[in-house]
């Protein structure tokens, strides 16, 4: 058993049928010695008397808010949460496996640049009695500071019969140098509590590996005289690291017909313009990627050919 | 990206082209190592990230773009002395900092070159003959060093009398390649920045 925060405790249980559970001793936070009784949650049934209460915690029915009283007055509370270990592996009931980029990915994180700012998000089908708390650091043995905001509900989607809820959090490394070569990964730890169930999820990454630039901005077409060709031009996104000559991007320009089946023409360039053939009803899209370290491509920025 | 690429003109800065070749070569070598050594811990998540140049060179600091010198987090300065002549310096206007930067890059390359050659000698003794260093990568390191053209004491190749532990050597190869790829990215950024200046 360990303390999650003041008066909230997590009991770690080896979770299998007929498991013996864990013996827990609760102590009433009071100078009083006599006439103390204990109850669980809203029940008025007296579980025991005295300054300490010994309980055998086996299942969720044994978890909850234990209260010690004296003469009708509440003296203190202890909330017991359960953390299930199933065959040596901590349970992951609360969050959905996003399966991207690999199985058992519960937290996904992205950064728009090298400033040390990043966003993480996760999915759940649970709509109520749910709280998250996020901590982060650079490295784990001698951790350096990363400050995270509060996790917020950022999207709701309907997936078949289920509603899916997306939560996200923004974090900022306290003293980040965009040009630094990372040798210690960022660690992100999310505590999740649903009713009386506690779970924790972690992710470890280098900022360089989670970079996903914003799409190029000011995408424009300039028709070339007496030709079906057009000059496409664009600019680096505002959110990208500067100077651009150091933090360079490479671009992919795509000409896509109206039908998804039509052949796509693609050109790769390090410049911020390209000459392509504009077909009728087609659209031109451009996306960006770090020129030197191949992390994710940005989303497409698009304009119609007409 | 084996599709049409509009390649930029390397311009007046001869090292840019070599640094791009270097990044391509080390990336290819790392990919080959990951595939060949699939039963070894060779992914970024599994290895310890070690920098053999730590406390010996300070390329990131010496090559910091002017725009980032205002960022206190980037000024984790270390005093290191460097030789300051080199053929990538395009004009006399080149600052002392730029000379320091390029000489730091040269020292990095020299250190990695020695490590890689020592390692290759060990890998050639492996009866499994599982993996060797790409000669193209070693050649590209050499070309960039020649383009930088710094006079520097030659570092003797490390020789070891004891029987090599091939498992450890292969893990060390992965660690070295990951670190060298990261340094190659920095070198490419620096060359691009200097070329644009």
């Amino acid at each position: 058993i360990w303390e999650l925060k003041k008066d909230v405790y997590v009991v770690e249980l080896d979770w299998y049928p007929d498991a013996p559970g864990e013996m827990v001793v609760l102590t009433c936070d009071t100078p009083e010695e006599d006439g103390i009784t204990w109850t669980l949650d809203q029940s008025s049934e007296v579980l025991g008397s005295g300054k300490t209460l010994t309980i055998q915690v086996k299942e969720f029915g044994d978890a909850g808010q234990y209260t010690c009283h004296k003469g009708g007055e509440v003296l203190s509370h202890s909330l017991l949460l359960l953390h299930k270990k199933e065959d040596g592996i901590w349970s992951t009931d609360i969050l959905k496996d996003q399966k991207e980029p690999k199985n058992k990915t519960f937290l996904r994180c992205e950064a728009k640049n090298y400033s040390g700012r990043f966003t993480c998000w996760w999915l759940t089908t649970i709509s109520t009695d749910l709280t998250f708390s996020v901590k982060s650091s650079r490295g784990s043995s001698d951790p350096q500071g990363v400050t995270c905001g509060a996790a917020t509900l950022s999207a709701e989607r309907v997936r078949g019969d289920n509603k899916e809820y997306e939560y996200s959090v923004e974090c900022q490394e306290d003293s980040a140098c965009p040009a630094a070569e990372e040798s210690l990964p960022i660690e992100v730890m999310v505590d999740a509590v649903h009713k009386l169930k506690y779970e924790n999820y972690t992710s470890s990454f280098f900022i360089r590996d989670i970079i996903k630039p914003d799409p190029p901005k000011n995408l424009q077409l300039k028709p070339l005289k007496n030709s079906r060709q057009v000059e496409v031009s664009w600019e680096y996104p505002d959110t990208w690291s500067t100077p651009h000559s150091y933090f360079s991007l490479t671009f992919c320009v795509q000409v896509q017909g109206k039908s998804k089946r039509e052949k796509k023409d693609r050109v790769f360039t390090d410049k911020t313009s390209a000459t392509v053939i504009c077909r009728k009803n087609a659209s031109i899209s451009v996306r960006a990627q770090d020129r030197y370290y191949s992390s994710s491509w940005s989303e497409w920025a698009s304009v119609p050919c007409s | 990206r084996n599709l049409p690429v509009a390649t930029p003109d390397p311009g007046m800065f001869p090292c840019l082209h070599h640094s791009q070749n270097l990044l391509r070569a080390v990336s290819n070598m790392l990919q080959k190592a990951r595939q060949t050594l699939e039963f070894y811990p060779c992914t970024s998540e599994e290895i310890d990230h070690e920098d053999i140049t730590k406390d010996k060179t300070s390329t990131v600091e010496a090559c910091l773009p002017l725009e980032l010198t205002k960022n206190e987090s980037c000024l984790n300065s270390r005093e290191t002395s460097f030789i300051t002549n080199g053929s990538c310096l395009a004009s006399r206007k080149t600052s002392f900092m730029m000379a320091l930067c390029l000489s730091s890059i040269y020292e990095d390359l020299k250190m990695y070159q020695v490590e890689f050659k020592t390692m290759n000698a060990k890998l050639l003794m492996d009866p499994k003959r599982q993996i060797f260093l790409d000669q193209n990568m070693l050649a590209v390191i050499d070309e960039l060093m020649q383009a930088l053209n710094f006079n520097s004491e030659t570092v003797p190749q490390k020789s070891s009398l004891e029987e090599p532990d091939f498992y450890k050597t292969k893990i060390k190869l992965c660690i070295l390649l990951h670190a060298f790829r990261i340094r190659a990215v920095t070198i490419d950024r620096v060359m691009s920045y200097l070329n644009a200046s």
Epitope: D14, Y16, P17, E86, G88, D93 | -
Partner: antibody, heavy 115, light 112 residues
Framework: QVQLVQSGGGVVQPGRSLRLSCAAS????????MHWVRQAPGKGLEWVAF????????YYADSVKGRFTISRDNSKNTLYLQMKSLRAEDTAVYYC????????WGQGTMVTVSS | SYVLTQPPSVSGTPGQRVTISCSGG????????VKWYQQLPGTAPKLLIY???QRPSGVPDRFSGSKSGTSASLAITGVQAEDEADYYC????????????FGTGTKVTVLG
């Protein structure tokens, strides 16, 4: 006393369906994940499927994906395996088992797929 | 296809020490716990070892388990005639958990 009692096995023709049941008693069935494991005659153990305690997530071996469906009725304390498009290679003793460091197995039920 | 490899058979005379190996990889045994089961003919498997080296109550102390790197082993110190059975190791793969990974199985024969 934890008990898992299986039923529903038998002889079936290729391409036909069969449903296996596993009745649980002696524990809070709705709190625990459950597996199906099979063993072809003279062969080793092969995992077939898993279902979470609340039925929210199901996992299948590639060999049965799209043909077999694991389900549970927590109000009846029963685990099911619906088997469709059965093949000769599905012939095996099928076991249900609890998930956890200490597990309990059903007695097994024989499924024979033969024309 | 089995990812955990066991020898098809091992044998020993009563009182001898018998060991069964179970070889896997970094993503399974290398990063998960190992269990061992004993299966007597015509019966369901019985848990012998969980958590690499833990014995459930009721399992004789002549059975012991261990794990090192990507391999695990089961030792029977002082093998007895009633130990003649099939033995299976079991673990998980970090990418496919909670799918159970079973070993290929080992037939233990007690001679004489």
């Amino acid at each position: 006393q934890v008990q898992l009692v299986q039923s529903g096995g038998g002889v079936v023709q290729p391409g036909r369906s069969l449903r296996l049941s596993c009745a649980a008693s002696g524990f809070t069935f709705s709190s625990y994940g459950m597996h199906w494991v099979r063993q072809a005659p003279g062969k080793g153990l092969e995992w077939v499927a898993f279902i979470r305690y609340d039925g929210s997530n199901k996992y299948y071996a590639d060999s049965v994906k799209g043909r077999f469906t694991i389900s549970r009725d927590n109000s009846k304390n029963t685990l099911y395996l619906q088997m469709k498009s059965l093949r000769a290679e599905d012939t095996a003793v099928y076991y249900c088992k609890t998930h956890g460091s200490h597990d309990n197995w059903g007695q097994g039920t024989m499924v024979t797929v033969s024309s | 296809s089995y990812v955990l490899t066991q020898p098809p058979s091992v044998s020993g005379t009563p009182g001898q020490r018998v060991t069964i190996s179970c070889s896997g990889g970094r993503s399974n045994i290398g990063s998960n716990l190992v269990k061992w089961y004993q299966q007597l003919p015509g019966t369901a498997p019985k848990l012998l070892i969980y958590g690499n080296d833990q014995r459930p109550s009721g399992v004789p102390d002549r059975f012991s388990g261990s794990k090192s790197g990507t391999s695990a082993s089961l030792a029977i110190t002082g093998v007895q005639a009633e130990d003649e059975a099939d033995y299976y190791c079991q673990s998980y793969d970090r990418g496919t958990h909670p799918a159970l990974l079973f070993g290929t199985g080992t037939k233990v024969t007690v001679l004489g």
